[in-house]
């Protein structure tokens, strides 16, 4: 996490710059949204709780061809501690719950602006 | 055309619970935040809280042990409880949306604001 | 919690005078900044939001800047619907406080 912070980062990126970092980069996504998201494709649901960075990834990793989250795969990637690829699932994600990228982009943004404002970076 | 507009009682005994209503108009209360900020004669501007489209809710600390908030979503209704009211805690009372897609918090649109007297 | 300290606390001013209001932060709050016009009696009214973007309805002439801890509301040729109290507000970390205001009267 120390080390999040884009490819273009001068050095180490203290917790809550990255999180400040993602939640703009969500807050992006989400202003610039004209057409559907991401063609509207659908993602697992996840439990926005412990653990849930490398869920968010997991989830968003299967969504192909949609250079709109494209950065925020990578800034999630420097949250989550082990490598993820597509296909790949944790007990995190909610299996019967399918949700447009769009909607999950709008709960992650949320629930990590909460964590923020409350000074929870890790 | 966005509206808040705050109810409750202008005058209440100490220790008394206060209730104050935010009725909203113009957006949903499952799209935006509503926050609640109160301001003493005179004096600056206080944040008490703020009731998350998701339900949620978070607190200003010092405030915390006293306060809650509720909302009815069918009814376009925030309710803000306040217990143990002092002499200290009158101020005009106001809800407040909050900006929400940006990654900071702000508050875009005000009630006209309820002046509450604890006496 | 963050304090916000404005200065000054109050000024006069003269119809097209230039008026800048500052607003210092005790610790880092990026951009996340927020300029409020109140008159008596009234609420708050949003000038400014993320440091320098102009909320919709509100003059030109209003204007913030800066970064970090230091930031500044400038009103470039005051009007006379200008004379009010304007407050600062971080948005960065709860509690969400305000600056003490500045109130703006007429030289």
């Known amino acids: 996490l120390t080390c999040l912070g884009g490819f273009a980062s001068p050095g180490p990126v203290p917790p809550s710059t990255a999180l400040r970092e993602l939640i703009e980069e969500l807050v992006n996504i989400t202003q610039n949204q004209k057409a559907p998201l991401c063609n509207g494709s659908m993602v697992w649901s996840i439990n926005l709780t412990a653990g849930m960075y490398c869920a968010a990834l997991e989830s968003l990793i299967n969504v192909s061809g949609c250079s709109a989250i494209e950065k925020t795969q990578r800034m999630l990637s420097g949250f989550c501690p082990h490598k993820v690829s597509a296909g790949q699932f944790s007990s995190l994600h909610v299996r019967d719950t399918k949700i447009e990228v769009a909607q999950f982009v709008k709960d992650l943004l949320l629930h990590l602006k909460k964590l923020f404002r409350e000074g929870q970076f890790n | 055309q966005v509206t808040l507009k705050e109810s409750g009682p202008v005058l209440v005994k100490p220790t008394e619970t206060l209730t104050l209503t935010c009725t909203v108009s113009?957006?949903?209360?499952?799209?935006?935040?509503v926050q609640w900020i109160r301001q003493p004669p005179g004096k600056a501007l206080e944040w008490l809280g703020v009731m998350w489209s998701d339900g949620d809710t978070s607190f200003n600390s010092v405030l915390k042990s006293r306060l809650t908030i509720s909302r009815d979503t069918s009814k376009s209704q925030v309710v803000l409880t306040m217990t143990n009211m002092d002499p200290v805690d009158t101020a005009t009372y106001y809800c407040?949306?909050?900006?929400?897609?940006?990654?900071?918090?702000?508050?875009?649109?005000w009630g006209q604001g309820t002046l509450v007297t604890v006496s | 919690d963050i304090q916000m300290t404005q200065s000054p606390s109050s000024l006069s001013a003269s119809v097209g005078d230039r008026v800048t209001i500052t607003c210092l932060a005790s610790e880092d709050i990026s951009n996340y900044l927020a300029w409020y016009q109140q008159k008596p009696g009234k609420a708050p009214k949003l000038l400014i939001y993320h440091t320098s973007r102009l909320q919709d309805g509100v003059p030109s002439r209003f204007s913030g800047s800066g970064s970090g801890t230091d930031f500044t509301l400038t009103i470039s040729s005051l009007q006379p619907e200008d004379f009010a109290t304007y407050y600062c507000?971080?948005?960065?970390?709860?509690?969400?406080?305000f600056g003490g205001g500045t109130k703006v009267e007429i030289k």
């Open positions: 407040a949306r909050d900006g929400t897609i940006a990654a900071m918090d702000y508050f875009d649109y």
């Open positions: 113009g957006f949903s209360l499952t799209n935006y935040h």
């Open positions: 507000q971080q948005g960065y970390r709860f509690p969400l406080t």
